[in-house]
Interface confidence: low
């Protein structure tokens, strides 16, 4: 449905408030270093222009594509060359190359200061003084730090952010009301960002087919009563939405997401019995709710899969006629029967099935060749089951912090070239799988754990891609999307690593550690642990545990001392000497 003016079309569809918010997100995700005020100015100029196009779609430049309009606007930033260096070269290109160029320069780990939360009274005053600017600033700060954040979902977060301040700034105890809500939004926001980053990586690095396979598996688990044709339609629409958002087409993405939510709710009888409550909510909540909806119950009378996919004499004929459709049907049928499997496991099974058919349908006796294909699935299913069982036992034995430490040691030994902050961040997140998933019954553990690990390992992959330092990481990240976790699990200690020289400065601590939150103190200790392993990769668990126990005792002792700084200086020297002796450094 071609419109004379795309910008007018989107402005009318989305409304002024959402239009402005989405343009701000888009600009902040592209130019991550630009000051807030500059972005607001650009957004206001684009909005005024859009209004002229709504009034007259034939007005000058209104027929230009959104990429052309937005790219032209971004390229007016005076300090582009000084602030962004070679990104300024994008402006010499024509569309669509210019937009591709901007996309390639998105930075997953921008050099931006940590967001420090002001005092509650300061935040409430700022909120009351200028609510609109306060909320825009939230969008801007999140978008520039998370350049792939799912834009329509960020609007939902902003709505909840506004609601939290509206309620809590009037409360008797503002802090008690507000801080838990902000913590929840922060944690959910980080998780949402990481999940979307995996979707974009899937599309950008492995292509549309890989994303569609993921979507078929996930939607079939979620909507097992829906027909294959219905699931296929939803997959096609969902792929379009995420392709647009990952490509920076945020207005189209938000518009199409709203259309998809509308379609799902209008057709919920043929999709899922679990959608009723979601579909009664306003748009942003509705879309979020649908995305998170629990799996529907499986139909009671599903026949055995073997009949259609192994025993039938038409397997090779059906496969040859339409390979992707037949494999899609296999994946749909398998996934709707197995909500207890992770999506990545289902995709591994489908890949094994595809490989077997490719080989067997060219053989003298195809049926004889593929008759035992389902037997090949057994080890693929047992591998994540066993891994999750072992790690949940370890988690229950150690608790989250020590479980994270075990993973820190494990991953530092596997890929010691990776930077210490990245190893700490990734291992901490890997360790959270315990509290997130091990509490679930067996039937829910694998989809929770392995699909979460896929999200976390993708963080490692995108951070590593910026500055590649380990061919082992590159190999696990690029060879197969669905085998990333097994690839990392299979890595042993890197015997080729040249240990870092012992540097006492790395293990010198000061009294400021005493004023840190428990989480920040943990990160300090975990940073030291990674550095220890980098110095002494062959250190045993027992040696490392002894040093870390001494370190914890040292921090506790000095934080209780009257002269903390002197304690840290003197006891710190002793600790370093003892650690060197314990580790043979």
């Amino acid at each position: 449905d071609a419109h004379k003016s795309e910008v007018a079309h989107r402005f009318k569809d989305l409304g002024e408030e959402n239009f402005k918010a989405l343009v701000l997100i888009a600009f902040a995700q592209y130019l991550q270093q630009c000051p807030f005020e500059d972005h607001v100015k650009l957004v206001n100029e684009v909005t005024e222009f859009a209004k002229t196009c709504v009034a007259d779609e034939s007005a000058e430049n209104c027929d230009k594509s959104l990429h052309t309009l937005f790219g032209d606007k971004l390229c007016t930033v005076a300090t582009l060359r000084e602030t962004y260096g070679e990104m300024a070269d994008c402006c010499a290109k024509q569309e669509p190359e210019r937009n591709e160029c901007f996309l390639q320069h998105k930075d997953d780990n921008p050099n931006l200061p940590r967001l420090v939360r002001p005092e509650v009274d300061v935040m409430c005053t700022a909120f009351h003084d200028n609510e609109e600017t306060f909320l825009k600033k939230y969008l801007y700060e999140i978008a520039r730090r998370h350049p792939y954040f799912y834009a329509p979902e960020l609007l939902f977060f902003a709505k909840r952010y506004k609601a939290a301040f509206t309620e809590c700034c009037q409360a008797a105890d503002k802090a008690a009301c507000l801080l838990p809500k902000l913590d929840e939004l922060r944690d959910e926001g980080k998780a949402s960002s990481a999940k979307q980053r995996l979707k974009c990586a899937s599309l950008q690095k492995f292509g549309e087919r890989a994303f569609k396979a993921w979507a078929v598996a996930r939607l079939s688990q979620r909507f097992p009563k829906a027909e294959f044709a219905e699931v296929s339609k939803l997959v096609t629409d969902l792929t379009k939405v995420h392709t647009e958002c990952c490509h920076g087409d945020l207005l189209e993405c938000a518009d199409d997401r709203a259309d998809l939510a509308k379609y799902i709710c209008e057709n919920q009888d043929s999709i899922s019995s679990k959608l009723k409550e979601c579909c009664e909510k306003p748009l942003l909540e509705k879309s979020h709710c649908i995305a998170e909806v629990e799996n529907d119950e499986m139909p009671a009378d599903l026949p055995s899969l073997a009949a259609d996919f192994v025993e039938s004499k038409d397997v090779c004929k059906n496969y040859a006629e339409a390979k992707d459709v037949f494999l899609g049907m296999f994946l749909y049928e398998y996934a709707r029967r197995h909500p207890d499997y992770s999506v990545v496991l289902l995709l591994r099974l489908a890949k094994t099935y595809e490989t077997t058919l490719e080989k067997c349908c060219a053989a003298a006796d195809p049926h004889e060749c593929y008759a035992k294909v389902f037997d090949e699935f057994k080890p693929l299913v047992e591998e994540p089951q066993n891994l999750i069982k072992q790690n949940c036992e370890l988690f229950e034995q150690l608790g989250e912090y020590k479980f994270q430490n075990a993973l820190l040691v494990r991953y530092t030994k596997k890929v010691p070239q990776v930077s210490t902050p990245t190893l700490v961040e990734v291992s901490r997140n890997l360790g959270k799988v315990g509290s997130k998933c091990c509490k679930h019954p067996e039937a829910k553990r694998m989809p929770c754990a392995e699909d979460y690990l896929s999200v976390v390992l993708n963080q490692l992959c995108v951070l590593h891609e910026k500055t590649p330092v380990s061919d082992r990481v590159t190999k696990c990240c690029t060879e197969s999307l669905v085998n990333r976790r097994p690839c990392f699990s299979a890595l042993e200690v890197d015997e080729t690593y040249v240990p870092k020289e012992f540097n006492a400065e790395t293990f010198t601590f000061h009294a400021d550690i005493c004023t840190l939150s428990e989480k920040e103190r943990q990160i300090k200790k975990q940073t030291a642990l990674v550095e220890l392993v980098k110095h002494k990769p062959k250190a045993t668990k027992e040696q490392l545990k002894a040093v870390m126990d001494d370190f914890a005792a040292f921090v506790e002792k000095c934080c209780k001392a009257d002269d903390k700084e002197t304690c840290f200086a003197e006891e710190g020297k002793k600790l370093v000497a003892a650690s060197q002796a314990a580790l043979g450094l």
């Epitope: 070239q417 930077s419 500055t467 590649p468 330092v469 380990s470 061919d471 590159t474 890197d494 080729t496 690593y497 040249v498 240990p499 870092k500 020289e501 540097n503």
Partner: nanobody, 117 residues
Framework: EVQLLESGGGLVQPGGSLRLSCAAS????????MSWVRQAPGKGPERVSA????????IYADSVKGRFTISRDNSKNTLYLQMNSLRPEDTAVYYC??????????PGQGTLVTVSS
């Protein structure tokens, strides 16, 4: 963007010497171990030598021990390989990589070393 530009290669007689340099940019050079890797015509890549981030730890392939010396100058973001007593079997394209990798880390083309009389 990670850039690694190797230089210093050339034609040298058996027993001669060469000093290779690798100028690094686009990442914090002083934080990473570095390696020299070589690839002879028709063969796979072979790691010749590696050095820790601060220069204190080095390792060498058996075939070059006692003849080659790896070093680095973190203030200049540069990695070096001093090659003495060169042999015909040292003929290869030499490139530097980040970490222990034997795959190129940047767009550098490597530098060709030919040992021939």
């Amino acid at each position: 963007e990670v850039q690694l530009l190797e230089s210093g290669g050339g034609l040298v007689q058996p027993g001669g010497s060469l000093r290779l340099s690798c100028a690094a940019s686009g990442f914090t050079f002083g934080q990473f171990g570095m390696s020299w890797v070589r690839q002879a015509p028709g063969k796979g890549p072979e790691r010749v030598s590696a050095i820790s981030s601060d220069g204190s730890g080095t390792i060498y392939a058996d075939s070059v021990k006692g003849r080659f010396t790896i070093s680095r100058d973190n203030s200049k973001n540069t990695l070096y390989l001093q090659m003495n007593s060169l042999r015909p079997e040292d003929t290869a394209v030499y490139y530097c990589t980040i970490g222990s990798s034997t795959t190129p880390s940047g767009p550098g083309q490597g530098t060709l070393v030919t040992v021939s009389s």
